[in-house]
Amino acid sequence: IPPHVQKSVNNDMMVTDNNGAVKFPQLCKFCDVRFSTCDNQKSCLSNCSITSICEKPQEVCVAVWRKNDENITLETVCHDPKLPYHDFILEDAASPKCIMKEKKKPGETFFMCSCSSDECNDNIIFSEEYNTSNPD
């Protein structure tokens, strides 16, 4: 932190390493929940025109795709990976790409991904060829 920039006691707006370097915040698509036409595709664009600066530098980009009997929605937000989102841990927060993984939610099909490169939640990937994690 520069000497002329005052330190604050409880500061979650600023992430620093041991040398005092400051982390730049993530730039993420941030349209909250919108109706989507993304269905049965290997990947989709978010069609979100809003790229926001995440409020806290530790936050990453998140996308949530949900399908039920009535509609399909895509949610794009910033979120702190230390905290659960929709009751799920963001396991893939360090990934540069947003690789969708299915989560168990009663009454709907629910996929979620997180990533940590600029606007990475603009391109959401469902294709198995990108997913190198174990199938279980």
Partner: nanobody, 124 residues
């Protein structure tokens, strides 16, 4: 020597406007994403707005979106922040900062990445 020099701060009434400037020298301005960052008294840094080096693509924090406009003049090596509809919570020291493509962390040295700041006070 890298220098970032902010100006344009001052006292303004709620609902008023200010235009901040940041004069850059000592580096290739057109290679850097530029930021406005602010720090309210006793608070942490808040990243307000950013602009790409070429193409002038802009980004805003949700707290200022629709009220603030960032711009740059690459021919003058200058960054601007037009602040409209100012609120008491916008009171802070405003800094400009620079970011190389792909850079995730910023060194703490004020000479490398930070200006000295300009104080904006919004009060009636």
């Amino acid at each position: 020597e890298v220098q970032l020099l902010e100006s344009g701060g001052g006292l303004v009434q709620p609902g008023g406007s200010l235009r901040l400037s940041c004069a850059a020298s000592g580096f290739t301005f057109t290679e850097y994403r530029m930021w406005w960052v602010r720090q309210a008294p006793g608070k942490g840094l808040e990243w307000v707005s950013a602009i790409e080096p070429i193409g002038n693509r802009t980004y805003y924090a949700r707290s200022v979106d629709g009220r603030f406009t960032i711009s740059r003049d690459n021919s003058k090596n200058t960054l601007y922040l037009q602040m409209n509809s100012l609120r008491a919570e916008d009171t802070a020291v405003y800094y400009c900062a620079k970011q190389m493509p792909g850079q995730k962390w910023m060194a703490k040295s004020r000479f490398d990445y930070w200006g000295q700041g300009t104080l904006v006070t919004v009060s009636s």
